[in-house]
């Protein structure tokens, strides 16, 4: 009696169970009464990453330098190429199909987490006692200068964008 279901790594065709092709190979002929499933290796720059009955291998992803992409891991016959972004850029999605420039944190904000190839800069507002006076993708909020430790006094209060201005203490004459 013809099978209605097949074992793992097999598929049903023409009332018989045929072996699937292993990762890295594509199907060129279903099995017959007289022959096993016939598979051929994927070509250069192609891959298949599962047991399959695909008649065409998939093309490796192209890491387009015009989109800021570069190869993080070269593809094999069984794996796709993994792209990442050039220094200073990060992926716009999990699939990393294009890159955008890392965001800079504006004055008044500091870098909480430096960007990676896959995540953007995370900024945070500078809390009281800290400031940032530059637009930067790397600079954290800096603490206000402590005038006291320099034996000086605050002449101008700091803000989230400016440091305090210290000056000499008034001397009693």
């Amino acid at each position: 009696e013809p099978p209605t279901a097949c074992r793992e790594k097999q598929y049903l065709i023409n009332s018989q169970c045929c072996s699937l092709c292993q990762p890295g190979q594509k199907l060129v002929s279903d099995c017959t009464e007289f022959t096993e499933t016939e598979c051929l290796p994927c070509g250069e720059s192609e891959f298949l990453d599962t047991w399959n009955r695909e008649t065409h291998c998939h093309q490796h992803k192209y890491c387009d330098p015009n989109l800021g992409l570069r190869v993080q891991q070269k593809g094999t016959s069984e794996t796709d190429t993994i792209c990442t972004c050039e220094e200073g850029w990060h992926c716009t999605s999990e699939a990393c199909e294009s890159c955008v420039l890392h965001r800079s944190c504006s004055p008044g904000f500091g870098v909480k987490q430096i960007a990676t190839g896959v995540s953007d800069t995370i900024c945070e507002p500078c809390p009281v006692g800290f400031f940032s006076n530059v637009s930067s993708a790397f600079e954290k909020c800096h603490p206000w200068t402590s005038c006291e430790t320099k034996d000086l006094v605050v002449q101008q209060a700091g803000t989230n964008k400016t440091d305090v201005v210290c000056g000499p203490q008034d001397r009693l004459r």
Partner: antibody, heavy 114, light 112 residues
Amino acid sequence: QVQLKESGPGLVKPSETLSLTCTVSGFSLPTSGVHWIRQPPGKGLEWIGVIWAGGDTNYNSALMSRVTISKDNSKSQVFLKMSSVTAADTAVYYCLGHGHFDVWGQGTLVTVSS
Amino acid sequence: DVVMTQSPLSLPVTLGQPASISCRSSQSLVHSSGNTYLQWYLQRPGQSPGLLIYKVSNRFSGVPDRFSGSGSGTDFTLKISRVEAEDVGVYYCSQTTHVPWTFGQGTKLEIK
């Protein structure tokens, strides 16, 4: 029913290229492979190669450098070309449908001689 | 490539008597699927080869039941229980488990 018919010149000069055609009926070239097999007079059978449904090919490594198999799906024809032939290539050449091993063509005798 | 070795190469048999042909392969013909793709063909004088047995022991449709195939791994046998006049010709074993497909040298069966 499945039928295959081999055709081509019966005489080829040494160092020239042997060209044969296999015309098939009863099955579809876009969904089935075709093999070429040869048999020198009074000797055994030798598998030459196959062209699969999608156009991919496998060849006998001993003949690979001289053999090309191609096809024209619209004409239901498969072609065998073998370059730089010698007297050792004198044989009956058969084509065979993949999965139809019960049906062989009648074969065509190719003699390599000057 | 898988080398197929047949014996004997010549087999004179009396009509009505049994006959046996051996075929050995240089490596196992068992595919990872568990199937073994070993065929037997008969080439009658002046004709193309005709399929007798496939997958070691399956008789092709229309093949008389006096023909039987057996074996496993690398050792295979074709038996004819009672030879008839129409059985004369050259018998070939063939493997299609591994590319390139290969054939035995052939065994010529003739009537004594």
